[in-house]
């Protein structure tokens, strides 16, 4: 019997009946055994087929078989109801071998030419299975020349049988207080040959409760207890199960904080598995009762281990633990059934005693000493000499613990000194130099420091003066001896003030004329305002209307008098404003350089002379009455004049303050 070629040589060839293409003889029997490599099959087809036709091919035939199975018995030329001829059919071996038998009987009614066939080895696609047959692989099948292999989806591993996919279902740990777990693929059939371990591990103090839900279907046996697939539940106290079948197991109260669930499956079966919903319980903590003026959140029917609540106070109340304020409060239930922190109190917010208001006072409106939430206090300033700036002085104790004004300010109101108050009443006439009386010029400041000079009080901690009067002390402000509240230059009874800083106008050049002859002194402390110490007002925008030519201003100081000595008593003089061109012309002739009088100056005095400020008055204020506000304001600062004070045809020259309002305001606001 001829054999096909041995592999690994190519397996292919031709078969033919004896004598082909001539007729075959009687009583012939030929057998060919073809063998392909493992993983291959043989393909055979006929290019010529002409055999005697007989009932069920009993006479002459070609029989194809593979192993024990007969694939076909062929005869004739074309197929009939009971006989088969190959026609264009292709035949395949079931394995890697194919037997071909040719037989002719003792006679032929007419000559038949037999057959010619060709064969070849080809790869078997093991992944192709007939309908109804079990798949080659559990998950994925991969064909290749001479064989195949299986692989698994993520979460599975190939079993050692190389076909089954076992679930990678161990090592899952559930730590939440409740959750769900199920057999792999639930509710689809669970995988074969798997061993699953699930752990529920909660904090000590919790007890796990297991409920089987929806459906339960695990392969069982009518006589033996769960011999194939089973589910077991293990705690540190006891074991539950094994479970199998179709009945939902009852709830399991484990009384344990750790549970191990084991699920084992064999190689067969088609069952949907199980699903467990687990919850937990613990010893409850005492129900939290909210403190007065507070509430608990969240509100629960009971609070067990790890549950927490917070306390929130009503508006106007604050959390206190003992006497200490808490930003927030949260208590956590512990495993022994106690809360980890004691309940706080919601205590009414207390704004505390209000701060003292300099030059003012505070009055309790709600009740004596009441400083709690919504209490009202009223600040007011000392009458006559101070006025309240910013707000109306009414403050309420708000929920944030601050006294707050009706405008929402938390800072104190400011008692600002009233400016421009004087005891003096003026007529329209020009008087000679006269002694000042108490309260006439309460803004008058005496400046000692090398020479005698003057200044005017602004607010309660600034002095306005001439730059030339304090130029020498600009770098040694503390050397200035500043006195106020007195009429007598040499009196021991005065209010002492000291300088913190001296600000000389940046446009002033010493010994080069008197343009920009203006300076400010910042006092190191605020002075107390009274009838003898009151600031002068700064000019309003409209002040020019009270400073026209021939309007009367008043200069005051302790400067030289007609006798040639410094005045012992504060003196003052009422003098008219002089036309600017007239004044400029008066100082155009020698010994005065051209341009001595600038637009930053104003002149005052009599053409006939006799009334003037003089040395020692420098820096003092030339003041005017604002008839609308009935307050005095500073229009000029004593600056310079003729060598001989009060000389006819010459005038006193004063720094024009209204030109310097922005400069003054900037210095004061910045420092």
């Amino acid at each position: 019997t001829p054999l096909g070629p041995k592999w690994p040589e190519p397996v292919f060839g031709r078969l033919a009946s004896p004598g082909f293409p001539g007729e075959y003889a009687n009583d012939q029997e030929r057998r060919w055994t073809l063998t392909a490599p493992p993983g291959y099959r043989l393909r055979l087809y006929f290019t010529h087929f002409d055999l005697e036709l007989s009932h069920l091919c009993e006479y002459d035939f070609v029989k194809l078989s593979s192993g024990a199975k007969v694939l076909a018995t062929l005869c004739g030329q074309e197929s009939t109801d009971t006989e088969r001829a190959p026609g264009k059919d292709t035949f395949y071996s079931l394995g890697s071998s194919l037997d071909i038998t040719f037989r002719s009987d003792y006679s032929n009614e007419k000559p038949f030419t037999g057959f010619e066939a060709f064969y070849a080895a080809e790869d078997i696609d093991e992944c192709q299975v007939a309908p109804g047959e079990a798949p080659t692989c559990d998950h994925h099948c991969h064909n290749h020349l001479g064989g195949f292999y299986c692989s698994c989806r993520a979460g599975y591993v190939l079993h050692r049988n190389k076909r089954t996919c076992s679930a990678l279902c161990s090592g899952q740990v559930f730590t939440q207080r409740s959750g769900e777990l199920s057999s792999p693929e639930y509710p689809r059939p669970y995988p074969k040959l798997s061993s699953c371990t699930y752990s529920i591990s909660l904090e000590e103090g919790f007890s796990v409760i297991l409920d089987f839900v929806e459906s339960f279907d695990v392969e069982t046996h009518p006589e033996t207890l769960c011999p194939y697939d089973f589910l077991k539940i293990q705690t540190d106290r006891e074991e539950h199960g094994p479970f199998c079948g179709k009945t939902l197991p009852h709830r399991i109260e484990t009384k344990s904080n750790t549970v191990t669930i084991t699920f084992v499956t064999d190689e067969s079966g088609d069952h949907t598995g199980w699903k467990i919903h687990y919850t937990s319980t613990a010893q409850p903590c005492p129900y939290p009762m909210a403190p007065p003026n507070g509430h608990v959140s969240p509100v629960q029917a009971k609070y067990i281990l790890k549950d927490s609540f917070s306390i929130f106070c009503e508006t106007g109340y604050e959390l206190l633990q003992g006497h200490l304020p808490l930003k927030s409060f949260t208590a956590v239930c512990q495993k022994d059934g106690s809360w980890d922190r004691p309940m706080p109190a919601c205590s009414i917010v207390d704004c505390g005693p209000p701060d003292d208001l300099p030059s003012g006072r505070v009055e309790y409106i709600t009740g004596p000493g009441v400083t709690t939430y919504k209490a009202v206090i009223q600040y007011s300033c000392e009458e006559t000499f101070y006025t309240m700036k910013v707000n109306d002085g009414k403050y309420v104790c708000e929920a944030d613990g601050f006294w707050t004004s009706s405008k929402g300010e938390k800072s104190l109101p400011v008692c600002e000194p009233v400016c421009g108050l004087s005891a003096r009443t003026t007529g329209g006439r020009i008087y000679g130099g006269q002694k000042a009386k108490p309260g006439d010029f309460p803004w008058q400041v005496l400046i000692l420091g090398g020479t005698t000079a003057a200044g005017a009080l602004l607010y309660d901690n600034w002095v306005l003066t001439a730059a030339h009067a304090v130029y020498e002390q600009k770098h040694d402000a503390s050397a200035l001896d500043i006195r106020m509240g007195t009429l007598k230059r040499l009196s021991p009874h005065y209010t002492q003030a000291w300088s913190e800083a001296v600000f000389i106008h940046e446009g002033y050049t010493h010994d080069a004329g008197f343009d920009n002859d203006i300076a400010l002194i910042k006092l190191n402390n605020k002075v107390v305002i009274n009838s003898n110490i009151t600031p002068i007002c700064l000019p309003r925008k409209e002040a020019e209307s009270f400073m026209r030519t021939d309007d009367i201003g008043t200069a005051s100081g302790w400067g030289l008098t007609q006798r040639g000595f410094l005045a012992r008593n504060l003196m003052y003089v009422d003098i008219p404003i002089v036309d600017h061109q007239k004044c400029t012309a008066a100082y155009e002739k020698p010994p005065y350089p051209r341009g001595s009088v600038t637009a930053n100056m104003l002149c005052a005095g009599l053409e006939s002379g006799g009334k003037d400020s003089c040395r020692g008055d420098s820096g003092g204020a030339l003041v005017f009455l604002d008839s609308e506000t009935e307050r005095w304001f500073v229009g000029g600062i004593v600056s310079w004049g003729s060598m001989n004070c009060g000389e006819a045809g010459q005038y006193g020259v004063y720094t024009k303050v209204i030109n310097y309002i922005p400069w003054i305001e900037n210095i004061i606001s910045d420092f």
């Epitope: 633990q321 003992g322 304020p325 808490l326 930003k327 949260t330 207390d350 505390g352 613990g401």
Partner: antibody, heavy 118, light 106 residues
Framework: QVTLKESGPVLVKPTETLTLTCTVS??????????VSWIRQPPGKALEWLAH???????SYRTSLKSRLTISKDTSKNQVVLTMTNMDPVDTATYYC??????????WGQGTLVTVSS | QPVLTQPPSLSVSPGQTASITCSGE??????AYWYQQKPGQSPVLVMY???QRPSGIPERFSGSNSGNTATLTISGTQAMDEADYYC?????????FGGGTKLTVL
């Protein structure tokens, strides 16, 4: 005007007991939410809270020194007393008493330097 | 006892902003307090309950506290602000201080 003043020995021997007195004025030890705290500061080191007492007589101590500390108050004398037993050279520090209000230690005494040495 | 951690030192130029931090576990859930101490002097409370300024403390001092960090910010730092700064918080009725930050104004 709130003031607090510490008084007590400037030198103590090891193993002895330190008694410090804080005399307060300008606020009451018997009403409101005020408290008095003792804080110490070893030379060149940080502040270290020791104990406090409130108007309600609620007391609290530093955990690590609890067994050695006692705080008390005498409302009639406006005084708070701290005793510290078994003194050791490492307890050398400036000891401050201070007022607690709204959780903040808002007024402090000038402090008293206590040296522990044999 | 919980620990409050501060940087040991911080240097700023005059006029610059200084931010001093204090960190501790869940510090933002508690109130933070800040103290200034100049050499040879007692400490002074400069900030209470995270961001409240006691009267007399300049507006350039501000505070914040969230998460694990409280911050004291001094905007427009001046030479007079050179000092040691300590943070403090209350934990179960006991006070805890930070190790202090030495602020140097260059």
């Amino acid at each position: 005007q709130v003031t607090l003043k510490e008084s007590g020995p400037v030198l103590v021997k090891p193993t002895e007991t330190l008694t410090l007195t804080c005399t307060v004025s300008g606020f009451s030890l018997s009403r409101g939410k005020m408290g008095v705290s003792w804080i110490r500061q070893p030379p060149g080191k940080a502040l270290e809270w020791l104990a406090h007492i409130f108007s309600s007589d609620e007391k609290s101590y530093r955990t690590s020194l609890k067994s050695r500390l006692t705080i008390s108050k005498d409302t009639s004398k406006n005084q708070v007393v701290l005793t510290m037993t078994n003194m050791d050279p490492v307890d050398t520090a400036t000891y401050y008493c201070a007022r607690i209000r709204a959780g903040g230690i808002d007024y402090w005494g000038q402090g008293t330097l206590v040296t522990v040495s044999s | 006892q919980p620990v409050l951690t501060q940087p040991p030192s911080l240097s700023v130029s005059p006029g610059q902003t200084a931010s001093i931090t204090c960190s501790g576990e869940k510090l933002g859930d508690k109130y933070a307090y800040w103290y200034q101490q100049k050499p040879g002097q007692s400490p002074v409370l400069v900030m209470y309950q995270d961001k409240q300024r006691p009267s007399g403390i300049p507006e350039r001092f501000s505070g914040s506290n969230s998460g694990n960090t409280a911050t004291l910010t001094i905007s427009g730092t001046q030479a007079m602000d050179e000092a040691d700064y300590y943070c403090q918080a209350w934990d179960s009725s006991t006070a805890v201080f930070g190790g202090g930050t030495k602020l140097t104004v260059l």
